[in-house]
């Protein structure tokens, strides 16, 4: 029989490396998405980013972000999203609840959804990295 392993203790700089990788990949995704001309950002979509009532890195809404990016992957075949999802999974607890996303059906609206979420994801990873590094600085002072 098997016993559950002890909780995994990851050094904060390992978590930071994951978020740095996500930040870099988010820029790649946004650059790719922005190549589509004539598409405007929409106010109708909001990507959950950081939770104010949790400590880094658990303050990142990774399960919801994953669900939004999975939706983009289904709408537009961006292979970089596969790698993004693999890294997000390093931050997602196995028992995290699922997030349901309502997908736009109109082609142009889909493009607006993709651009908006990609832009918000890039900004979110910048914020996440800032919250991680400032948290690390506070921990050492």
């Amino acid at each position: 029989s098997h016993t559950l392993p002890v909780r995994l203790l990851r050094p904060s700089d390992d978590v930071q490396k994951i978020v740095e990788e996500l930040q870099s990949l988010s820029k790649m995704l946004l650059k790719d998405v922005e190549e589509e001309k004539g598409v405007l950002v929409s106010q109708n979509y909001t990507l959950p980013c950081l939770s104010p009532d949790a400590q880094p890195p658990n303050n990142i809404h990774s399960p919801a972000i994953r669900a939004y990016l999975k939706t983009i992957r289904q709408l537009d075949n961006k292979s970089v999203i596969d790698e993004i999802i693999e890294h997000l999974d390093k931050l997602i607890f196995q028992d995290a609840p699922e997030t349901n996303i309502s997908v736009p059906t109109d082609t142009h609206e889909c493009k607006r959804f993709i651009l908006t979420i990609s832009q918000q994801f890039s900004e979110c990873m910048d914020l996440a990295l800032k919250s991680l590094t400032s948290g690390a600085q506070q921990a050492t002072t």
Epitope: I85, D89, I92, F93, D95
Partner: antibody, heavy 122, light 107 residues
């Protein structure tokens, strides 16, 4: 107790396909990646691909792309690995494996199936 | 794809010897590495995950460490039952490649 039970040994002709199953029991979580690995006689372990059973999301080794298809049936907690256009070099033991731990991403494969021997011979 | 270069491919040591096996990753994998033991005709068994955490029930003589992109599995005092082939595998990004394996024998 977590268990992975694979289907029985297969003998196949070159050019045909094989589908190996892997049934999980005693595991309740949905956010995890299961992998498929093979081992040719006297050789090392070779990663073939992985599936996220909750969504059917898959990743494949470049070497097997186009020849391997990994699927999962959530209702029966069973994963499948199908390899087509078989050749003699595909004679190997095929394993499914999956992790235990607190994150969706693996950092080690804790549980392994017993292995399925596939022999490709004319 | 990230390459895992494992060395040596085989080694022979005496009972009680300290044995080290190394895997070098072609890029930084930030501790996302596991070590497995496979005895002849048996299923691989997880020894170490996340570079240095021992799996449940693994004898304390097995340990893992890291220096940059080099990961080491150490058997502090080799026992007859440790005769096996040892593999590393990374999990930083797919494909989750394995090292070529190290066959450990008793002198």
């Amino acid at each position: 107790q977590v268990q992975l039970v694979q289907s029985g040994a297969e003998v196949k002709k070159p050019g045909s396909s094989v589908k190996v199953s892997c049934k999980a029991s005693g595991y309740t979580r949905t956010r995890y990646w299961m992998q498929w690995v093979r081992q040719a006689p006297g050789q090392g372990l070779e990663w073939m691909g992985a599936i996220y059973p909750g969504e059917g999301d898959t990743r494949y080794s470049q070497k097997f792309k186009g020849r391997v298809t990994i699927t999962a049936d959530k209702s029966t907690s069973t994963a499948y690995m199908e390899l087509s256009s078989l050749r003699s070099e595909d004679t190997a033991v095929y394993y499914c494996a999956f992790p235990e731990g607190q994150y969706a991403a693996p950092y080690g494969m804790h549980y392994w199936g017993q292995g399925t021997t596939v022999t490709v011979s004319s | 794809a990230i390459q895992m270069t494992q060395s040596p491919s085989s080694l022979s040591a005496s009972v009680g010897d300290r044995v080290t096996i190394t895997c070098r990753a072609s890029r930084n994998i930030h501790n996302y590495l596991a070590w497995y033991q496979q005895k002849p005709g048996k299923v691989p068994k997880l020894l170490i995950y996340y570079a240095k955490t021992s799996a449940s029930g693994v004898p304390s003589r097995f340990s893992g460490s890291r220096s940059g992109t080099d990961y080491t599995l150490t058997i502090s005092s080799l026992q007859p039952e440790d005769v096996a082939t040892y593999y590393c595998q990374h999990f930083w990004k797919t494909p989750w490649t394995f090292g070529g394996g190290t066959k450990v024998e008793i002198k």
